[in-house]
Amino acid sequence: EEELQVIQPDKSVSVAAGESAILHCTVTSLIPVGPIQWFRGAGPARELIYNQKEGHFPRVTTVSESTKRENMDFSISISNITPADAGTYYCVKFRKGSPDTEFKSGAGTELSVRAKPS
């Protein structure tokens, strides 16, 4: 089986303030076992946006049916976008363990926020 790839097809997405942003991410394999997480930014200061494993993320919903193992679409929708949400978002696959370890990251999707149309 080929090694898992994390595919973020959109290099950039532009959304009007107040709207929802859909950030696309698919993986190409069921292996390894472990959660998907979304981050804004890279490096040690990156901000966790969504964790499949745990946590409360009231503005984030998953786009696809997440209760089936064969689902490989981990796209998310972030509601009520504001200018503060601008940045590059990374979909990251982790390998289950203690601790979970980062296995592979997508290339990132840059979110830009347009002014709310008047």
Epitope: E1, S66, T67, K96, G97, S98
Partner: antibody, heavy 118, light 107 residues
């Protein structure tokens, strides 16, 4: 409805063989890690074996070299071939499905009884 | 192998009581800890995964907590149907291992 139904249990003499089957319905078995767990009468639960989505297999130490886990995708079924059976293998054997992203057990079969006795 | 130790091994309680069962792992298992309920002659039922997440259909009177090596299962306001044996299990790495069980009996 998601369901697992085991069969193939019975009485066998020490040193004998038995093949347990687990028929899955309501989901695609090959998309999930699948497990066998056993329970001797009046005792606790013991994990026995697992097969991953890539066909990778795992066993508890006491059955290594004697038991073989496999699956048949066309029949949506899981199997446990048990050879060189010992009295200590006497137990109810459960087929269990691993969870969507972390392999947490979510669906259990009703169990099939294996008795090893002369 | 990772050893899982539950306490107590048995527990007597009354309907309406709140009870807590603990589970300790011999090494850090992150939060890959599950809890199961089993009634005599029946297959186990999955209650909790990743230490605190409830499986679909499990009532909210069941709650779990912990991370690393120490975990708890709490049942608030016991009902007659809750008297059963409870098992914890680590599933961070093979071989997956269970605690020895806690038998919850009616006082």
């Amino acid at each position: 409805e998601v369901q697992l139904v085991e069969s193939g249990g019975g009485l066998v003499q020490p040193g004998g063989s038995l093949r347990l089957s687990c028929a899955a319905s309501g989901f695609t078995l090959s998309s999930y890690d699948m497990h066998w767990v056993r329970q001797a009468t009046g005792k606790g639960l013991e994990w026995v074996s697992a097969i991953g989505t890539a066909g990778d297999t795992y066993y508890t130490g006491s059955v290594k070299g004697r038991f073989t886990i496999s699956r048949e995708n066309a029949k949506n079924s899981l199997y446990l071939q048990m050879n060189s059976l010992r009295a200590g293998d006497t137990a109810v054997y459960y087929c269990v499905r691993g969870g969507v992203w972390d392999d947490a057990f979510d669906i259990w079969g009703q169990g099939t009884m294996v008795t090893v006795s002369s | 192998d990772i050893q899982m130790t539950q306490s107590p091994s048995s527990l007597s309680a009354s309907v309406g009581d709140r009870v807590t069962i603990t589970c300790r792992a011999s090494q850090d298992i992150n939060n890959y800890l599950a809890w199961f309920q089993q009634k005599p002659g029946k297959a186990p039922k999955s209650l909790i995964y990743t230490a605190s997440s409830l499986h679909s259909g499990v009532p909210s009177k069941f709650s779990g907590s912990g991370s690393g090596t120490d975990f708890t299962l709490t049942i608030s306001s016991l009902q007659p149907e809750d008297f059963a044996t409870y098992y914890c299990q680590q599933y961070v790495s093979y071989p997956y291992t269970f605690g020895q069980g806690t038998k919850l009996e009616i006082k």
